[in-house]
């Protein structure tokens, strides 16, 4: 069977993507300029390193983490890079328009690139739920809608709830998870006969997914501390994230063994559970006052992640059509909620300790913030899902789900690559 890219997409994708890129270039030309102030070069290098860590997380970490499908590993990695590159460009412009535009020009700094990379990361988390069932043209739509929704959510939360960069960005876990799950819910669900093998994992792609997990594991402290404004807060965030992810690795591997009748370790469980602590500790990483608390949180997160990986895929596969190995969506949704609950608990403790009263009001505000993030994620996810179902995108036929050969040129076209 010929595996050429469908003719219609061959017309649609380059035109759509290159027109969009040309539009972005024009927007950058008219509305942006670099920060021209003299800065301490050492500080500049240190600032760049944080951005570099985030890019490594996005391109290598999330890129490879989603590459465990037997027949869809190339697409997972490369499509991730494509989305990251596009998402960062749009996020820089959007953040600038939302926060700086009254002054007429968007000033681009290393910090704005850092923010944009984190916004683009949201898409890479969400897309795990739909990779293999959509083409690049559809992914472009998903990037634009999700980055726009997240940017607006952050601005609204900042203005209504008076929160800083870190707090309004840490809703990314919950936002990305629910966005991805609601998009997946809109897409055709049942896997047609004869494609069941394609959404299974294979040894070499699973190894590359583990490599992705390792990169994420190493750089998660950078992600959680990137938007904190003082050295002491960053130090706390780095330490607490490190303790949490360290414990979640131990919990993931031992918990995975415990969950298997023969005591065997599941690759899929481990891929995502090693990151559990980092997600759960994200919102409050700078606030947790002692290592043991971060470690307990890592333990709980690891157990939730393994438990979720064991019992939720069946449900997700039936209801949302998400394959068993794409567990980032429901994993992040649970762990993101755990992180938000921990933050609310810490807020209550602070209010009680300071003797300032109004505990109920503070809790209500935090729940309002979280609810807003979930509602906007679900609404914008459903909107995206509906858009992706439009015929104009020439979505892959269901028989071509999870198949690199639909998108890539393989000179040999060897059977069972």
């Amino acid at each position: 069977m010929s595996s050429k890219y469908p003719r219609s997409v061959r017309r649609c994708l380059p035109l759509w993507a290159l027109t969009l890129e040309a539009a972005l270039i024009l927007l950058f030309y008219f509305f942006t300029h670099y920060d021209a102030s003299l800065e301490d070069q050492k500080g500049l290098v240190a600032s760049y390193q944080v951005g570099q860590d985030l890019t490594v997380m996005a391109a290598i970490g999330l890129g490879f983490l989603t590459s465990s499908f037997r027949r869809h590993s190339w697409s997972s990695v490369a499509f991730n890079l494509f989305m990251l590159a596009l998402g960062v460009q749009w996020a820089i412009l959007l953040d600038g328009f939302l926060s700086q535009f009254p002054s007429g020009k968007v000033v681009i700094t290393l910090f704005s690139i850092r923010l944009a990379t984190m916004s683009a990361l949201s898409v890479l988390i969400s897309v795990d739920a739909v990779l293999g069932k959509v083409n690049l043209a559809q992914l472009v739509v998903m990037v634009l809608v999700e980055v726009t929704a997240l940017g607006n959510l952050r601005m609204v939360i900042s203005n209504i709830f008076n929160t800083d960069y870190h707090m309004n960005m840490m809703h990314i876990y919950v936002f990305a998870a629910y966005f991805g799950l609601s998009v997946a819910w809109c897409l055709p669900k049942p896997l047609p006969e004869g494609t069941e093998d394609k959404d299974q994992t294979a040894t070499i792609p699973s190894l590359s997914a583990m490599l992705g997990a390792l990169f994420l594991w190493m750089f998660w402290p950078s992600f959680n501390s990137a938007l904190l404004r003082s050295p002491i807060e960053r130090k706390n965030a780095v330490f607490n994230t490190y303790y949490a992810v360290a414990v979640s690795v131990v919990t993931a591997i031992s918990g995975s063994s415990l969950a298997h009748p023969q005591g065997k370790i599941s690759k899929t469980y481990v891929h995502s559970a090693v990151l559990a602590g980092g997600v759960a500790v994200g919102t409050s990483c700078h606030l947790i006052p002692s290592p043991w608390l971060a470690m307990v949180l890592g333990l709980v997160a690891g157990l939730i992640s393994v438990g979720g990986a064991k019992y939720l895929p069946g449900c997700c596969n039936r209801v949302l059509g998400i394959p068993h190995s794409s567990i980032m969506g429901y994993n992040f949704s649970l762990l993101g909620l755990l992180g938000e609950i921990i933050y609310i608990v810490l807020l209550v403790l602070d209010t009680v300790g300071a003797g300032n009263g109004m505990i109920g009001f503070q809790v209500l505000l935090s729940i309002g913030e979280l609810s807003l993030a979930i509602v906007i994620a679900l609404m914008s996810g459903l909107l995206t899902g509906l858009l992706l179902n439009l015929k104009i995108w020439k979505a892959p036929h269901e028989a071509k789900y999870f198949d690199d050969q639909v998108f890539w040129k393989f000179p040999h076209l060897a059977v069972g690559f």
Partner: antibody, heavy 125, light 107 residues
């Protein structure tokens, strides 16, 4: 002893530029966020801009966005405020202030614990 | 969040109790509210941070309280050196904002 010393103020015509400096001593400058705050004659305090400890991020009041640029040189322990397209309403005493972060019960508190003595900028034709 | 201080001017005698109010247009974390004192020709001086914690070297006659949108600075017994202008200030998301100030003057 912590000291912040502003300089660079003076009389300038509308539309022209001026650059303020704030020399810091007595503390590790590179670990603190730094702010500019101004006070028009007979008026209250108005926050102008902040730069994070590592210079990675800068934030501005809407009234100065696009005209003022805050920067720092951690190797020289100096904070700067480049003021372009000055207007009459920019006439004020400009203070630099150090932002300290301290832990409360759980949350972190922020405060301007040290201020410079101020430098007067007069924008007049 | 905009901060509104009241009253604009407070005329009291030494030894009296002064209560200064600061109201925010939206809820702010008490960790992010501070009070400053400014005397003519001088730079502001930090009095209270985190809504209720006294800064180093500040006498215990100064106390702060409140949460949400309503905050209060109390001077239990006014001393002659306490007659000055007092500002509340908040930070949550940018921008940082100051109240318009309350002038405490001798009656």
């Amino acid at each position: 002893e912590v000291q912040l010393l502003e300089s660079g103020g003076g009389v300038v015509q509308p539309g022209r530029s001026l650059r303020l400096s704030c020399a810091a001593s007595g503390f590790t400058f590179s670990t603190y966020g730094m702010h500019w705050v101004r006070q028009a004659p007979g008026k209250g305090l108005e926050w102008v801009a902040v730069i994070w400890f590592d210079g990675s991020n800068k934030e501005y009041a809407d009234s100065v966005k696009g005209r003022f640029t805050i920067s720092r040189d951690n190797s020289k322990n100096t904070l700067y405020l480049q003021m372009n397209s000055l207007r009459a309403e920019d006439t004020a005493v400009y203070y630099c202030a150090r932002e300290e972060v301290v832990r409360g019960v759980i949350l972190w508190s922020r405060k301007f614990d040290y201020w410079g003595q101020g430098t007067l900028v007069t924008v007049s034709s | 969040a905009e901060l509104t201080q009241s009253p604009g001017t407070l005329s009291l005698s030494p030894g009296e109790r002064a209560t200064l109010s600061c109201r925010a247009s939206q809820s702010i974390s008490s960790s992010y509210l501070a009070w400053y004192q400014q005397k003519p020709g001088q730079a502001p001086r930090l009095l209270i941070y985190g809504a209720s914690s006294r800064a180093t070297g500040i006498p215990d006659r100064f106390s702060g309280s409140g949460s949400g949108t309503d905050f209060t600075l109390t001077i239990s017994r006014l001393e002659p050196e306490d007659f000055a202008v007092y500002y509340c200030q908040q930070y949550g998301s940018s921008p940082w904002t100051f109240g318009q100030g309350t002038k405490v003057e001798i009656k």
